[in-house]
């Protein structure tokens, strides 16, 4: 089930997911001057089962100045998630997919991809927040948000995070040192059942994740 809106905005903070839950959709977006190939995929979809998940459909872009005649690939659609928008900075190291069954890691970039990624999240998606560089986190509770279904409507839980204007970058759960890089981190999804085990896995993933390629933007 798609989440009807975006994760909450926290002043001076960005969010990311550790992995994308099955059903997450990533729109096929092309950079200026390029377009999706004719009959190409509309979006990529995280699909699979509890033991193995992967992204279906390959996004492909071609020059707007030419006819859509190259690299035609029949798309394989899949389920969508609530949208998330990110701006690509540089290639990231993918999370070990096996560590979160039923989830997909960040899909690799495609040729002539747009500078921002638009995800559609599904119920159960969890995202983590961190303060942007130059701000320090004051935690009142978990710095995360989960998309939940209540009485037939979706909502995101409110992350308990305040970012204060101190020259120290806060970290994701499990991180103790300030980030060396000013860049944000990739967004992903995690299990919708927030158990202790889930949280530990997610925390470990966050702690070991390399500096990411994405800085979240809110539309």
């Amino acid at each position: 089930e798609l989440c009807d809106d975006d994760p909450p905005e926290i002043p001076h903070a960005t969010f990311k997911a550790m992995a994308y839950k099955e059903g997450t959709m990533l729109n096929c977006e092309c950079k200026r001057g390029f377009r999706r190939i004719k009959s190409g995929s509309l979006y990529m979809l995280c699909t699979g089962n509890s033991s193995h998940s992967s992204w279906d459909n390959q996004c492909q872009c071609t020059s707007s100045a030419t006819r859509n005649t190259t690299k035609q690939v029949t798309p394989q659609p899949e389920e969508q998630k609530e949208r998330k928008t990110t701006e690509m900075q540089s290639p990231m190291q993918p999370v070990d997919q096996a560590s979160l069954p039923g989830h997909c890691r960040e899909p690799p970039p495609w040729e002539n991809e747009a500078t921002e990624r638009i995800y559609h999240f599904v119920v159960g998606q969890m995202v983590y927040y961190q303060c942007v560089q130059g701000y320090r986190a004051l935690h009142r509770g978990p710095a995360e948000s989960v998309c939940k279904m209540t009485h037939g409507k979706t909502r995101w839980t409110q992350p308990q995070l305040i970012c204060t204007g101190e020259m120290e970058t806060s970290q994701f759960p499990g991180e103790e040192k300030p980030q060396a890089s000013p860049e944000g981190r990739p967004e992903s999804e995690t299990s919708c059942l927030v158990t202790t085990t889930d949280f530990q896995i997610q925390t470990e993933m966050a702690a070991t994740m390399e500096t990411s390629i994405f800085t979240t933007e809110y539309q």
Epitope: E1, L2, D4, D5, D6, G23, M25, N27, E29, C30, R35, R36, S39, G40, S41, L42, Y43, L45, T74, P75, Q76, P77, E78, E79, Q80, R83, I118, H120, V122, Q219
Partner: antibody, heavy 118, light 110 residues
């Protein structure tokens, strides 16, 4: 709750032009593909085409390509279906629908009835 | 592209189960798992009942189930109720990046 709001019923003469609309929520409309589906009186559903309001990329069913035009206005979060020259056979209910999970249409407008008669 | 093939009508008594079949080709139903089913009551817009062959959106009764074998998909409604009386349409994504609907099946609850 996400809703697609369609424009009201239209009565036109053959040869006239027409543009009907489908308005979606401001926060997400431009990020979802919007399809148009025709249903003639007493008949079944026919997929006409689909458009991405974010960049106006459109795909058409071979049956409808060349006879209708899909467009969108991002600032108005509205998608449009238009004809430059209507025919009596265009008389039908037209639905817009959001492309959701697994390439299924998860949210539908209530439809716009178009009657073309001389 | 040709419409998917569905029976024009099916009927059943309250409490019974009925199955509606939807036959396509290897370019649509057989080639993808992107088969969905829609319910349409008279004068109303269609409503998504099943997607991805067998998944149910929230709010849809578990009396509705879907499956697929080869080029044929099926919708089964168990414990038939009066409010199930409606038209049902299958749909599939196709190899040409378009969609195709079935001709529709009118379900009558006797």
């Amino acid at each position: 709750e996400v809703q697609l709001v369609q424009s009201g019923a239209e009565v036109k003469k053959p040869g006239e032009s027409l543009k009907i609309s489908c308005k979606g929520p401001e926060y997400s409309f431009n990020r979802y593909w919007i399809a148009w589906v025709r249903q003639r009186p007493g008949k079944g559903l026919e997929w006409m085409g689909i458009i991405y309001p974010g960049d106006s990329d459109a795909r058409y069913s071979p049956t409808f390509e060349g006879h209708v035009t899909l467009s969108a206005d991002m600032s108005l979060t509205t998608a449009y279906l238009q004809w430059s020259s209507l025919r009596a056979s265009d008389t039908a209910m037209y639905y817009c629908a959001r492309l959701g999970s697994y390439y299924a249409f998860d949210i539908w407008g209530k439809g716009t009835m178009v009657t073309v008669s001389s | 592209q040709s419409a998917l093939t569905q029976p024009a009508s099916v009927s059943g008594s309250p409490g019974q189960s009925i199955t509606i079949f939807c036959t396509g080709t290897s370019s649509d139903v057989g080639g993808y798992n992107y088969v969905s089913w829609y319910q349409q009551h008279p004068g109303k817009a269609p409503k998504l009942m099943i997607y991805d062959v067998s998944k149910r959106p929230s709010g849809v009764s578990n009396r509705f189930s879907g499956s697929k074998s080869g080029n044929t998909a099926s919708l089964t409604i168990s414990g038939l109720q009066a409010e199930d009386e409606a038209d049902y349409y299958c749909s599939s994504y196709t190899s040409s990046s378009t969609w195709v609907f079935g001709g529709g099946t009118q379900l009558t609850v006797l």
